[in-house]
């Protein structure tokens, strides 16, 4: 029997409770989104709550189950994929995570026409990647680093590549650095629009130095994980792109697509591939010194049976103030003439905007303009272009969806989302059906997320797909912190910040301040999104003020801010956090003796440097999986922003910007250093070197390692991590447990 005290006052205050750490760790207040799996202009698939795969037809309003949960369960399927001719479904099970995007799995093919699994010529296991052709039911898959093709699921496979070798040659899948820092996918193969051709990348890692670390497991001897991982300045993967005719794959075999001359003359990267038509493909290349990108449009020469990339179809994008693009070089969205395209790149004022390229980049027609940025082009149809930007009301941390009518002249612009649910929804993404007949809008906040379905012609809302009613009800008796997004103007720099305030915040009182920082190039922390997370709990229950600040190097506010950190990482990002803290102190409600900073990954680097800045502002801080020297991090990422660690390039700043160089300055702060020993991304080496430098300097500090955990510190480690950090902060701020 649980005795509850009777409510004396029926006031909201009494019925409400603060967030607990348990709420956060249990994911009690997590939200759902609804992204339709579009299969035509008016149909989509969705996995129902009871795990049936249901096909919805928007126009008829009908829905039916195409695959029962019973069939899914029979092979323990966690994912599925319908073939475009709707005759087969692949079922994915035995999911085994590798890196950020990559995983292996077992695949079963289910024949919808006879309700049976395809027997004979079954797929090998485990498969590294599998996908249907865009038309029909051809299958391409990667097994043991080689690519295979099936004309039909029951057919014997045709082996396309033969040189695949673990950690040496990767066909159709990226190696570690391409997966994490360039493609951001688990695959490196692309079907042409009608499935005639299959393009794929081959990565040769033969000469790349290997990172090796122990995986302790449960055995008597730990095993060693070896990953070809190019650190800054090291030998990089060698990439080649091939295309094979999938109708007659044995006829001429894979044909290599040439690299543009100005790219091939020195080390380079392949950055993306976009099919335009079945016989026209667009490849993007990038010099190793990443300020020059070349977009090359290549055509299939029937008479030659090869791919021709004329000089006239090479388009160069060059940055004179930083690196090419934002985080990545943007990809083109082709128009219906199959040669002109829309692309986001910096305009003359240094803001990323949509441009229309018909012949040369020099003659590009600017489609959007202003002191804000176009962020993503979702879809181009015959008469409309849909994109997202942060233009509305001049808040860089918002995302609204716009439609530009390109069929009429002059083109007219309409904000589709700006006034839909103005208070609740200021940060949107979208998902479009074929020909943009319909689209789903997914709103991430600042209110409770909501997903809705819309008519692509009229923009009319058709229905709510997910509104998180249960979450809304669950939060009714929770004292959530207050959030505000504002800006500071300092020395011609605008510093946007988000402040998370305790529920009963009183400006006349003094509160401990925690800075949460990421601060990496082209990142954005100050966003109008909903979140109930660890910092929400710290504000709600522990009475802390938490602030997030977007300083120099962050995105979507123009190139001046973005490229300010070019070739000098670890300087301005730290300065701007410090500047913001000083401004917060001036506001009068911060207890300046109780200020902390914490961050993860790049944020761990920034928090470490801030703690070691010698300002005396911070009492304590936490670095989770920090970078400690840019010489230890991946070439593709690091060199984009820092150049090469060579004497004639930028070695001096590589050396000056390490955490270790500032070991002495940690003497007067409480520092908690945390890292997973099996971090494939930011290697444990980084924290090992910080610890060594602190020991050598005889500086006391606290540390926690997580055995066999990667950069994400997932599972039970998450609970331990946040509990541990909470204790550390409460001790630092003299808060009772």
């Amino acid at each position: 029997i649980v005795l509850r005290p009777s409510r004396v006052h029926n006031s909201e205050e009494n019925t409400m409770r603060a967030l607990t750490l348990k709420d956060i760790l249990n994911g009690t207040f997590s939200y759902k989104t609804f992204f339709p799996n579009w299969i035509s202009g008016q149909e989509y698939l969705h996995q129902s709550a009871d795990n049936n795969i249901v096909l919805y037809n928007i126009e008829t309003g009908q829905s039916y189950t195409i695959l029962s949960n019973r069939t899914m369960k029979s092979v323990n399927a966690s994912n599925y994929g319908l073939s475009p001719d709707r005759q087969f479904v692949y079922l994915e099970s035995d999911y085994s995570k590798l890196w950020r995007y990559s995983y292996t799995a077992t695949y079963y093919i289910y024949d919808l026409s006879n309700g049976e699994f395809v027997r004979g010529n079954e797929l090998p296991r485990p498969i590294q990647y599998l996908c249907w052709s865009p038309v029909g039911s051809k299958l391409a898959y990667v097994y043991q680093n080689n690519i295979y093709l099936k004309q039909r699921p029951g057919d014997p496979p045709f082996q396309i590549t033969f040189n695949g070798r673990e950690n040496k040659i990767f066909n159709g899948i990226p190696d570690w650095v391409y997966e994490e820092e360039m493609l951001a996918t688990k695959y490196a193969l692309w079907w042409s629009p009608n499935g005639k051709f299959l393009a794929y990348a081959e990565f040769n890692d033969t000469d790349i130095p290997v990172i090796a670390y122990s995986y302790y497991g449960d055995e008597q001897y730990p095993r060693t994980i070896n990953i070809p991982y190019p650190k800054a300045g090291a030998k990089n993967p060698v990439v080649r792109i091939f295309i094979i005719d999938t109708t007659y794959p044995a006829y001429v075999g894979p044909q290599e697509v040439p690299v543009p001359a100005m790219i091939a003359s020195s080390d380079y990267y392949f950055s993306w591939l976009t099919w335009v038509t079945d016989e026209r493909v667009c490849l993007q290349w990038l010099k190793r010194v990443q300020n020059v990108s070349v977009l090359s449009i290549c055509d299939f020469r029937e008479d030659w049976q090869t791919w021709d990339c004329p000089k006239t179809q090479e388009h160069i994008e060059e940055s004179r103030t930083g690196w090419a693009g934002g985080f990545f070089v943007s990809t083109p969205v082709f128009s219906y003439d199959a040669i002109s395209y829309y692309k986001i790149f910096s305009d003359k004022d240094g803001y990323k905007h949509i441009h229309y390229i018909k012949d040369t980049v020099e003659n590009a027609i600017q489609i959007t303009s202003g002191k804000w940025e176009a962020i993503n082009i979702f879809r181009v149809t015959q008469d409309s272009l849909f994109y997202s930007s942060n233009e509305f009301e001049e808040y860089p941390g918002r995302r609204n969806i716009y439609r530009i009518s390109i069929g009429s002249y002059p083109p007219s612009k309409k904000c589709v989302t700006c006034h839909l649910r103005k208070e609740r929804c200021q940060y949107y993404t979208a998902s479009f059906s074929d020909y943009a007949k319909y689209y789903a809008l997914v709103c991430y906040g600042p209110g409770i997320p909501i997903s809705t379905l819309h008519d692509g012609r009229t923009d009319q809302e058709i229905k709510i797909l997910e509104e998180n009613k249960e979450l809304e009800n669950a939060l009714k008796n929770i004292q959530l912190p207050k959030e505000e997004i504002k800006k500071l103007e300092v020395d011609e720099i605008t510093l946007w910040y988000k402040m998370i305030l305790p529920p009963q915040f009183d400006r006349s009182k003094k509160y401990p301040l925690l800075i949460q920082v990421y601060g990496g190039p082209c990142s954005q922390s100050v966003r109008s999104v909903f979140a109930v997370n660890w910092i929400s709990y710290l504000a709600s229950k522990e009475g802390m003020v938490i602030a997030l600040v977007d300083g120099r190097g962050t995105a979507f506010q123009g190139d001046k801010l973005l490229y300010a950190v070019y070739r000098k990482l670890g300087v301005y990002e730290v300065e701007d956090q410090i500047t913001a803290v000083r401004k917060f102190i001036e506001m009068g409600f911060i207890d300046e003796k109780r200020i902390a900073i914490w961050g993860w990954s790049y944020g761990g680097y920034v928090s470490s440097l801030a703690l070691a800045s010698g300002t005396g502002l911070f009492k304590c801080g936490i670095a989770v999986a920090p970078v400690s020297s840019w010489e230890y991090y991946a070439s593709v990422y690091t060199e984009r922003f820092m150049g090469l660690p060579t004497k004639d390039d930028n070695l001096e700043h590589y050396k000056n910007s390490t955490v270790m160089a500032r070991a002495e300055y940690f003497r007067n702060v409480d520092y908690l250093l945390i890292h997973g020993t099996a971090d494939d991304n930011v290697h444990f080496q980084n924290s090992a070197q910080i610890a060594k430098a602190l020991v050598n300097a005889q500086v006391d500090f606290q540390a926690m390692w997580y055995s066999d955990q990667n950069h994400g510190l997932s599972g039970l480690s998450t609970n331990h991590l946040y509990t541990h950090m909470t204790h550390f902060l409460k001790q630092c701020f003299s808060l009772s447990d």
Epitope: A261, M262, A264, S265, W304, C309, K311, T360
Partner: antibody
Framework: DVQLVESGGGVVRPGESLRLSCAAS????????MGWVRQAPGEGLEWVSG????????YYADSVKGRFTISRDSSNNTLYLQMNSLRAEDTALYYC????????????WGLGTLVTVSS | EIVLTQSPGTLSLSPGERATLSCRAS??????LAWYQQKPGQAPRLLIY???DRATAIPDRFSGSGSGTEFTLTISRLEPEDFAVYYC???????????FGGGTKVEIK
């Protein structure tokens, strides 16, 4: 009609410099990649250098790398070849040539200008 | 660097005869090969590009064939004005260095 007229050739001593010019007319100079090809007396053709429209990329044969510099001035439709540290083996008839817009073969050639390097 | 070898060095033929000139590449150049004609005291003139496409105003007695590493220029019936030196040039993927063959001299027998 496409016309390419080279000038600037002459007799120089080893180690000296020379600047060749090529005046182009009859086509949109700024839209085409250009190159220099040379022919030593009684010998075959040797590609020397090329310059791209896009990005202004420049390319050189190994035999002249670091000594020769190709450039262009689209305002007066002129291609240049700055030749420093000249050697006896640079003695040749130097042709200015217009590349095809799609591929790097030479559609039109000038009549050439003779460079003689002799002590 | 891709090396082009032309053969024969000299071809002695009479007007009206068929001339077959060969150009061999040290590695595959696909179809990226051009042929030029050069007469004494004159600049080279483009005859064939992309291995087999005739340039503007080139008579159809000139034809090119081949791909990869083996290429042929054929002059079906030699005219008096065809006696000259012929050069092949590769421009594989438009990559420098562009290279020329050593030339074949077609002379009157």
């Amino acid at each position: 009609d496409v016309q390419l007229v080279e000038s600037g050739g002459g007799v120089v001593r080893p180690g000296e410099s020379l600047r060749l010019s090529c005046a182009a007319s009859g086509f949109t100079f700024s839209s085409y990649d250009m190159g220099w090809v040379r022919q030593a007396p009684g010998e075959g053709l040797e590609w020397v250098s090329g310059i791209r429209v896009s990005g202004g990329s420049t390319y050189y044969a190994d035999s002249v790398k670091g000594r020769f510099t190709i450039s262009r001035d689209s305002s007066n439709n002129t291609l240049y070849l700055q030749m420093n540290s000249l050697r006896a083996e640079d003695t040749a008839l130097y042709y200015c040539a217009k590349e095809n817009d799609r591929h790097s073969f030479f559609e039109y050639w000038g009549l050439g200008t003779l460079v003689t390097v002799s002590s | 660097e891709i090396v082009l070898t032309q053969s024969p060095g000299t071809l002695s033929l009479s007007p009206g005869e068929r001339a077959t000139l060969s150009c061999r590449a040290s590695q595959s150049v696909g179809y990226y090969l051009a042929w030029y004609q050069q007469k004494p005291g004159q600049a080279p003139r483009l005859l064939i590009y992309d291995a087999s496409d005739r340039a503007t105003a080139i008579p159809d007695r000139f034809s090119g064939s081949g791909s990869g590493t083996e290429f042929t220029l054929t002059i079906s019936r030699l005219e008096p004005e065809d006696f000259a030196v012929y050069y092949c040039q590769q421009y594989y993927n438009n990559w420098p260095p562009l290279t020329f063959g050593g030339g074949t001299k077609v002379e009157i027998k």
